[in-house]
């Protein structure tokens, strides 16, 4: 039943070309190259991809042809290293080309940039987009893959193919519609938002594998799949976890062809064995490949089997606990996690992992004690505070969200997090706090039983964004500590941070608070970001400012923007009223 055992192939590139087909092969190679060389122009990447594809075809025709036996890393790395401007564009990344595989690929991976210096994607007019789509559909879709991949160097490649398929469908449908914009724009907005969420979720998977190792990822997968497939047996879940780990290890490692191929195999296996996995897979398994894989990844939790026995019997009350633990520690802990998770779809995965870690620590201590059973008898009592902490936090924050609404809830989080880690750059604080604030509208609407898995696992994804952005230019020991000590305790670590008393307030700079008439033409979202940027800067200048003081200044600021955007001479209004606002704000905050 090993899904991924294939006969050895003389030519790996020919094997993947045949398995994936030309269209997917080309798309995946483009994604791979764009994720590695994020600054290269589109045309250069297309040229490289075409060269690789032509070479692959020669290998399909004759697997013994020259260089066809080389590994994909060797072939792709050699191709990337032919880029003429590598040293000028990428600096020290060019040194990777002096290395041999596998070190060369590792070097490329280390140079992936989570926050590349690229212009914001501006959406052209609908008619312009439709014309471009009709003129050259293939180039139009390739450009989409390229632009997403270079901005999201860890985007889950087979899932990006699914997004591209939906992107194509949106244009195919809407460019023929009577009201093109009304049809197309909501679809593009949805794809953009889902894409960002998908990218962030995959970034956490890659961080988990790369920073905390395979064991950490597998533990996460055991917990999540056991919640999703509670009727599946432990051996079945373990098998799925192994295969899923291989898929994500490959994608996170830049092995996108292998990853896409193995993901397809895994979807096939799941659908062939759905009777022993989940009753919820039927609809997913009737879909075409890309939709099928996506659907399986998002499938709702199956119903829990009736009459599951108490966990305590096997894991606390039994005299055999230490013996079973000693027989195969990780298998026993895996079984504990599986049994706990399948009974608790109402818990977040990170909470389940904290419980498993507590259980492991207890057994390590107690199985070496004089009376092991007496020592571990109360282990489930230790779980109570661990469960209550996220429950209480979610309850409080959902109440706050319902009271304030999303924008003001984001602002409350902006203030809270700026006070915790004021050294972090303002754009990062704004981006992360805005995303943290979205937990309200995303999760607080759910009933109690779904709130914690929604909220805390979402927060893990958002805090990972903070961690990867901070890792690029570390400025705060507190952020580093919370990000690196424990993957599952990141959120509690950040929650526990108090105001940073060691922080020396930023010098006041009037330029930071000088606004111009261009703010009036911004979308509501962009205007919010401007105001939230100002709020972060205010807190950095005056970390001891009270909520009331900050609220007063922000209210004045909103009134000032509204007033000047209605004025005939907007620029003069912003200049004159802006000076007054800055003076009034300084006085109000005692700056």
């Amino acid at each position: 039943r090993g899904v991924f055992r294939r006969d050895a192939h003389k030519s790996e590139v020919a094997h993947r070309f045949k398995d994936l087909g030309e269209e997917n092969f080309k798309a995946l190679v483009l994604i791979a190259f764009a994720q590695y060389l994020q600054q290269c122009p589109f045309e250069d990447h297309v040229k490289l991809v075409n060269e690789v594809t032509e070479f692959a075809k020669t290998c399909v025709a004759d697997e013994s042809a020259e260089n066809c036996d080389k590994s994909l890393h060797t072939l792709f790395g050699d191709k990337l290293c032919t880029v003429a401007t590598l040293r000028e564009t990428y600096g020290e990344m060019a040194d990777c080309c002096a290395k041999q595989e596998p070190e060369r690929n590792e070097c490329f991976l280390q140079h992936k940039d989570d926050n590349p210096n690229l212009p914001r994607l501006v959406r052209p007019e609908v008619d312009v987009m439709c014309t471009a789509f009709h003129d050259n559909e293939e180039t139009f879709l390739k450009k989409y893959l390229y632009e997403i991949a270079r901005r999201h160097p860890y985007f889950y490649a087979p899932e990006l193919l699914f997004f591209a398929k939906r992107y194509k469908a949106a244009f195919t449908e809407c460019c023929q519609a009577a009201d093109k914009a009304a049809c197309l724009l909501p679809k593009l907005d949805e794809l953009r938002d889902e894409g960002k969420a998908s990218s962030a979720k995959q970034r956490l998977k890659c961080a988990s594998l790369q920073k905390f190792g395979e064991r950490a990822f597998k533990a996460w997968a055991v917990a999540r799949l056991s919640q999703r497939f509670p009727k599946a047996e432990f051996a079945e879940v373990s098998k799925l976890v192994t295969d899923l780990t291989k898929v994500h290890t490959e994608c996170c490692h830049g092995d996108l062809l292998e990853c896409a191929d193995d993901r397809a195999d895994l979807a096939k296996y799941i659908c062939e064995n759905q009777d022993s996995i989940s009753s919820k897979l039927k609809e997913c398994c009737e879909k075409p490949l890309l939709e099928k894989s996506h659907c399986i990844a998002e499938v709702e939790n199956d119903e829990m089997p009736a009459d599951l026995p108490s966990l305590a019997a096997d894991f606390v009350e039994s005299k055999d606990v230490c013996k079973n633990y000693a027989e195969a520690k990780d298998v026993f802990l895996g079984m504990f996690l599986y049994e706990y998770a399948r009974r608790h779809p109402d818990y977040s995965v990170v909470l389940l992992l904290r419980l498993a870690k507590t259980y492991e620590t207890t057994l390590e201590k107690c199985c070496a004690a004089a009376d092991p059973h007496e020592c571990y008898a109360k282990v489930f009592d230790e779980f109570k505070p661990l469960v209550e902490e996220p429950q209480n936090l979610i309850k409080q924050n959902c109440e706050l969200f319902e009271q304030l609404g999303e924008y003001k809830f984001q602002n409350a989080l902006l203030v809270r997090y700026t006070k915790k880690v004021p050294q972090v750059s303002t754009p990062t604080l704004v981006e992360v706090s805005r995303n943290l604030g979205k937990v309200g509208s995303k999760c607080c609407k759910h009933p109690e039983a779904k709130r914690m898995p929604c909220a805390e696992d979402y927060l893990s994804v958002v805090l990972n964004q903070l961690c990867v952005l901070h890792e690029k230019t570390p400025v705060s020991d507190r952020v580093t500590k919370c990000c690196t000590e424990s993957l599952v305790n990141r959120r509690p670590c950040f929650s526990a941070l108090e105001v940073d008393e060691t922080y020396v307030p930023k010098e006041f700079n009037a330029e930071t608070f000088t606004f111009h008439a261009d703010i009036c033409t911004l979308s509501e979202k962009e205007r919010q970001i401007k105001k939230q940027t100002a709020l972060v800067e205010l807190v950095k200048h005056k970390p001891k400012a009270t909520k009331e003081q900050l609220k007063a200044v922000m209210d004045d600021f909103a009134a000032f923007v509204e007033k000047c955007c209605k004025a005939d001479d907007k620029e003069t209004c912003f200049a004159e009223e802006g000076k007054k606002l800055v003076a009034a704000s300084q006085a109000a905050l005692g700056l």
């Epitope: 373990s238 013996k323 195969a328 520690k329 199985c367």
Partner: antibody, heavy 119, light 111 residues
Framework: EVQLVQSGAEVKKPGESPKISCKGS????????IGWVRQMPGEGLEWMGI????????RYSPSFEGQVTISADKSISTAYLQWSSLKASDTAMYYC????????????WGQGTLVTVSS | QSALTQPASVSGSPGQSITISCSGI?????????VSWYQQYPGKAPKLIIY???KRPSGVSNRFSGSKSGNTASLTISGLQADDEAEYSC???????????FGGGTQLTVL
């Protein structure tokens, strides 16, 4: 320091039922599985069976089931391997190992006991 | 009959790298990386050199490394030395309430 010390070599006749021993020291004997391994002359290693001295739970490989008995006396931190009826083909080196983390991982081994069966 | 399959012998010259394979690992052993490797000199007890597929006990040279792909584990010895000449055996977890299994052993000859 963890040590497993095995009893000395045995020369036996077919049909006899010797008992060889493995004494553990330097660790909590009751908390680790002990495994017995056979190595016939010029051959590879074979797991025979394992025992958890804490409660004497014992498991045997199918090919050794009924041929040997594994036991332990936790009061003296000693595990035993006994034959029901020796055959010439039982001539081999026998090792005990402390199993750590999983029953396939012997992190400490005894020096081995050579059992020779000859009529 | 071993449940795990190893080549009977491999050889290499000093300074070279060699790899010994061990196929037939169970799904559960694979999932939890429960594969160990042992080195044994003639007349001596086996010595654990790799556990959990890739980990080395303290004191074992970093020339010894382990890996796994699918249901096959591998032991690689780089920079071969004369005293690496020995028998190498893999062992794997065989499931709950079961005894572990060994491979048939591989004799390494340093030429």
């Amino acid at each position: 320091e963890v040590q497993l010390v095995q009893s000395g070599a045995e020369v036996k006749k077919p049909g006899e039922s010797p008992k060889i021993s493995c004494k553990g020291s330097g660790y909590s004997f009751t908390n680790y599985w002990i495994g017995w391994v056979r190595q016939m002359p010029g051959e590879g290693l074979e797991w025979m069976g394992i025992i958890y001295p804490g409660d004497s739970d014992t498991r045997y490989s199918p090919s050794f089931e009924g041929q040997v008995t594994i036991s332990a006396d936790k009061s003296i931190s000693t595990a035993y391997l006994q034959w029901s009826s020796l055959k010439a083909s039982d001539t081999a080196m026998y090792y005990c190992a402390r199993l750590h983390g999983v029953v396939s991982r012997g992190d400490y081994w005894g020096q081995g006991t050579l059992v020779t069966v000859s009529s | 009959q071993s449940a795990l399959t190893q080549p009977a012998s491999v050889s290499g010259s000093p300074g070279q790298s060699i790899t010994i394979s061990c196929s037939g690992i169970s799904s559960l052993a694979g999932s939890y990386n429960l594969v160990s490797w042992y080195q044994q000199y003639p007349g001596k007890a086996p010595k654990l050199i790799i556990y959990e597929v890739t980990k080395r006990p303290s004191g074992v040279s970093n020339r010894f490394s382990g890996s796994k792909s699918g249901n096959t584990a591998s032991l690689t010895i780089s920079g071969l030395q004369a005293d690496d000449e020995a028998e190498y055996s893999c062992s794997s977890y065989a499931g709950r309430n079961a005894v572990a299994v060994f491979g048939g052993g591989t004799q390494l000859t340093v030429l």
